[in-house]
C-alpha cells in the first residue's frame, strides 16, 4: 500500500550486449543423410547479442559477427561399435551489438 516500506530494488534493464549462450550442435549440422551417430560435445558456448533497448521501435542486433570453426567428434555406431570421425562445425559469434531500428514489415505480394 501507499507509503509502505519496500525492500525490492529497482529493476535494471538487461542492456543490449554480447552474452554467452549455449548452442546445441544438432546432428543435422554434421550429416543430414544419416541418423545413426552421436556428436560430442552436444553443445557449445557462443557469444550472442541479447538484451532490450530503451525504445520499442528498436531491437538488439549484432553489428559485427565472426565465424569460428570448431572440431567435434562424430561417433558412428556400426554393429554396436563406434567408429570415430572428426567433423568441423562453423559457429557464429556476435562481437558487437547495437539497438537498431526495426525495418518496417514488407507487404506480402
Amino acid at each position: 500500500s501507499l507509503g509502505s516500506l519496500t525492500i525490492a530494488e529497482p529493476a535494471m534493464i538487461a542492456e543490449c550486449k554480447t552474452r554467452t549462450e549455449v548452442f546445441e550442435i544438432s546432428r543435422r549440422l554434421i550429416d543430414r543423410t544419416n541418423a545413426n551417430f552421436l556428436v560430442w560435445p552436444p553443445c557449445v558456448e557462443v557469444q550472442r547479442c541479447s538484451g532490450c533497448c530503451n525504445n520499442r521501435n528498436v531491437q538488439c542486433r549484432p553489428t559485427q559477427v565472426q565465424l569460428r570453426p570448431v572440431q567435434v567428434r562424430k561417433i558412428e555406431i556400426v554393429r554396436k561399435k563406434p567408429i570415430f570421425k572428426k567433423a568441423t562445425v562453423t559457429l557464429e559469434d556476435h562481437l558487437a551489438c547495437k539497438c537498431e531500428t526495426v525495418a518496417a514489415a514488407r507487404p506480402v505480394t
Epitope: 552421436l38 560430442w40 552436444p42 567428434r73 554393429r79 554396436k80 561399435k81 563406434p82
Partner: antibody, heavy 121, light 107 residues
Amino acid sequence: EVQLVQSGAEVKKPGSSVKVSCKASGYTFTESYMYWVKQAPGQGLELIGRIDPEDGSTDYVEKFKNKATLTADKSTSTAYMELSSLRSEDTAVYFCARFGARSYFYPMDAWGQGTTVTVSS
Amino acid sequence: ETVLTQSPATLSLSPGERATLSCRASESVSTLMHWYQQKPGQQPRLLIYGASNLESGVPARFSGSGSGTDFTLTISSLEPEDFAVYFCQQSWNDPWTFGGGTKVEIK
C-alpha cells in the same frame, strides 16, 4: 562380470617371437574392441593397437606396426597379440583391455591381469 | 601425438588428507579424458571417464574435473587403499595416449 584372463609369463630369446592370449568372458566378445597396452618396467602405459573381434580388422600405433600382430578367435572369445623379432626393449608387462561404452565416452573399462614378457639371452 | 604430462610425479600424503593430481595435455582433448588407478603387480582400474564421470563401484571420494588441456583428479580424503599410481588417458586424438603417472605414497 566382465573378465579378461591372460596367458602366463614368458621368457624369450632375442630375435624370437611370443604370442600372448587374452580370454574374455561376461560379455559378448564381438561387441567390443580389444586394446593392447604395453608397460615397460617402472614406466607408464603405452597403447599398441586394437582389434575388432567381429571381423578381425586392426589399428596399430605407428611404432608397433612392425612389432605386434593382433588376432582374435570368435569361437573361443580369445584375443591374441604376437610380438616378433624380440629385443630387450620389448621386455614389459602387456595388458589386454576392453573398450567400454559409457554414453559418449569409450574408456578401457576392463583389463586383463597382465602378461610379463622378458627378453633375455 | 598428444602428450599428457602428469604432476607431481610423486605425492606424499597421510591418510585423511586431500590429494590433487594434475594432467595437462599438449593440445585440447575436449573432455575425453579418463583416469585409472594401478596398484603394484595389478592391472589398471578405471576410476573416472569423460573427465568427470565416476565409474560404477568407485567410491565417491574420487572426483574429476577439467576440459580442454587441464584436468584434475581429486581424492577428497585418502584411505589406506588409495595409495597407488594414477594415470590419465585421452581418447580425443589418435593415437590415444597415457600420462606418465602420479604415485601417491604414504607420508
